[in-house]
């Protein structure tokens, strides 16, 4: 049928709850393409009635949720104006209960299921959560244990857990759960994490840069909505945190009963040597007391602000 | 059951470059430290370097200029080389990787070593 | 760099003894991690993070220290117990091992 195949390394995942997959490959998926998902070399397409439990959902394929029998190779077909590229992911799902004691029952997990804190640091666990625009995803709550996390060592940042002064007794099992909706209906997404903790410094303890912003104002009018975006390369070991902050506080606990401005959810490019993080910032409604006041964007030891200024009058 | 296995020549000629391969199983190398580690006879152990799971390679200031550390994840492979070898790089090689107990640091599982002699 | 320096370098005991090994560092390390070899083996992880045991490793070892200080003590030492073992530190780079401290029997 003229199409390449692709190969894509296996995905290990747990039944009962939901699970998504973006069929995206760049530089393929990045013109006009058409994408169809497709079961174990299946010639009729996966559906995309959305009340299906299995769907796709523009170049996604939904469980909701996912259950034993859907282990299998699924097939996404990329098709360009002169091209066409099938892909292949190999899902397995198997039968965990997170708060099992035997934890030897655990198959290899996909890496981002491991995560490493490093010791004496300020570091982050994330929690992964990728599904479709159709899909909401309530707070995340965290687990360590089967315990909620709670103390003041540890911060809820949007998909991320803070936690500072990394120490040996935070090595073990953590689960990070959200609550999804989609259509009207509420499904519980619960991602277990190995976590362990090493001394390395990892990433040789390279300085962060701040591409913008640069230290600058910017005109905005009273009551507008603005975003901005802080955009940090770094090297692709790091262990440092990026936020914005305001009088040495987070963004979202500054404004925590307001939520006029708010930290956005954080996003990766991965380049060969290094990664290109963007976090923004959204003041939802600029108010006058936000004229004037530095904007810092942090990452690691490195940081960067905005102010907000009012633009000059026009006398014309 | 992570398990270890170094492979290479047991015998490589002085200025010439000493390649090793450590091929693991039960475990993935795109997750922890993966290490090497040599012992010279009748010595004490030295610290190479690492590869880790991103692909970072961090290597000891005192090989730095002749080693390089790589892996192919697609294999489950990752590799050793020293160049301009002298008869002091005559030892015993080691690969290990830690993760025991949740500690990445704690080196548990090794490979059963491999001799590599420099002589001409 | 860390220099770790461990006393003594060889040691002569019985069976039934109270053997102390003691690693010094020449800066303050966060932990330690003591290796047992035996002649023609792979060093096996014996003590990590100071204090811990490794799995398979008698609770007649023991492991204590902070900062510059580190010591592995038995309590009563038994036939399996004599080789060469090793500490190591992960705190700062480059990462480094003691010179071994060589258990013989007198």
């Known amino acids: 049928d003229g199409c390449k195949d692709i190969f894509m390394k296996n995905e290990i995942l747990s039944a009962s709850q939901p699970f998504a997959f973006n069929c995206t490959f760049p530089p393929i998926t990045s013109g006009e393409v058409s994408v169809t998902w497709y079961k174990n070399s299946s010639k009729i397409p996966v559906s995309k009635i959305i009340q299906s439990r299995i769907h796709q959902d523009e170049t996604w394929i939904l469980f909701l949720p996912m259950e034993w029998g859907d282990s299998g190779v699924y097939q996404c077909v990329i098709k360009g104006r002169d091209s066409c590229h099938r892909i292949h992911v190999n899902l397995t799902v198997f039968e965990k209960h997170w708060c099992d004691t035997s934890i030897g029952g655990l198959p290899n997990l996909s890496d981002e299921y491991k995560q490493i804190l490093h010791l004496g640091k300020d570091d982050s666990l994330t929690c992964h959560l990728h599904f479709p625009k159709s899909c909401v995803l309530g707070p995340i709550k965290w687990y360590k244990d089967c315990n909620e996390i709670k103390g003041e060592r540890f911060t809820v940042l949007e998909t991320r857990l803070l936690v500072s002064n990394v120490s040996a007794e935070d090595r073990g099992n953590y689960a990070c759960q959200a609550i999804l909706t989609h259509s009207g209906k509420q499904y519980e997404v619960l991602n277990g994490i190995t976590v362990s903790i090493t001394e390395r410094a990892g990433y040789g303890g390279s300085v962060p840069k701040i591409i913008y912003p640069k230290n600058h104002s910017i005109e905005v009018q009273l009551g507008t909505t603005l975003i901005v975006d802080c955009n940090v390369t770094d090297t692709k070991d790091n262990t440092n945190l990026r936020c914005w902050r305001v009088n040495n506080t987070l963004v979202d606990d500054y404004y925590d009963e307001s939520k006029r401005i708010r930290e956005g959810v954080e996003t990766h490019v991965s380049f060969r040597e290094h990664n290109l993080y963007t976090v923004n910032i959204t003041f939802l409604e600029v108010k006058m007391e936000d004229y004037g006041l530095p904007f810092m964007c942090h990452a690691g030891v490195s940081t960067a602000y905005i102010i907000l200024q009012l633009p000059a009058p026009d006398f014309r | 059951q992570v398990q270890l296995q170094e492979s290479g020549p047991g015998l490589v000629k002085p200025s010439q470059t000493l390649s090793l391969t450590c091929t693991v199983s039960g475990a993935s190398i795109t997750s922890g430290y993966w290490n090497w580690i040599r012992n010279h006879p009748g010595k004490g152990l030295e610290y190479i370097g690492y590869i880790s799971y991103s692909g970072y390679t961090y290597y000891n200031p005192s090989l730095k200029s002749r080693v390089t550390i790589s892996r192919d994840t697609s294999k489950n492979q990752y590799y050793l080389k020293l160049s301009s070898v002298t008869a002091a790089d005559t030892a015993v090689y080691y690969c290990?990787?830690?993760?025991?107990?949740?500690?990445?640091?704690?080196?548990?599982?090794w490979g059963q070593g491999t001799l590599v002699t420099v002589s001409s | 760099d860390i220099q770790m320096t461990q006393s003594p370098s060889s040691l002569s005991a019985s069976v039934g003894d109270r053997v102390t090994i003691t690693c010094r560092a020449s800066?303050?390390?966060?932990?330690m991690y003591w290796y047992q070899q035996k002649p023609g083996k792979a060093p096996k992880l014996w003590i990590y993070?100071?204090?811990n045991l490794a799995s398979g490793v008698p609770s007649r070892f023991s492991g204590s220290g902070s900062g510059t200080s580190y010591t592995l003590t038995i309590s009563s030492l038994q036939p399996e117990d004599f080789a060469t073992y090793y500490c190591q530190q992960f705190t700062t780079s480059p990462y480094t091992f003691g010179q071994g401290t060589k258990l013989e029997i007198k």
């Open positions: 993070l100071t204090s």
């Open positions: 290990a990787t830690g993760g025991y107990d949740y500690v990445e640091d704690a080196l548990y599982y």
């Open positions: 800066s303050n390390v966060r932990y």
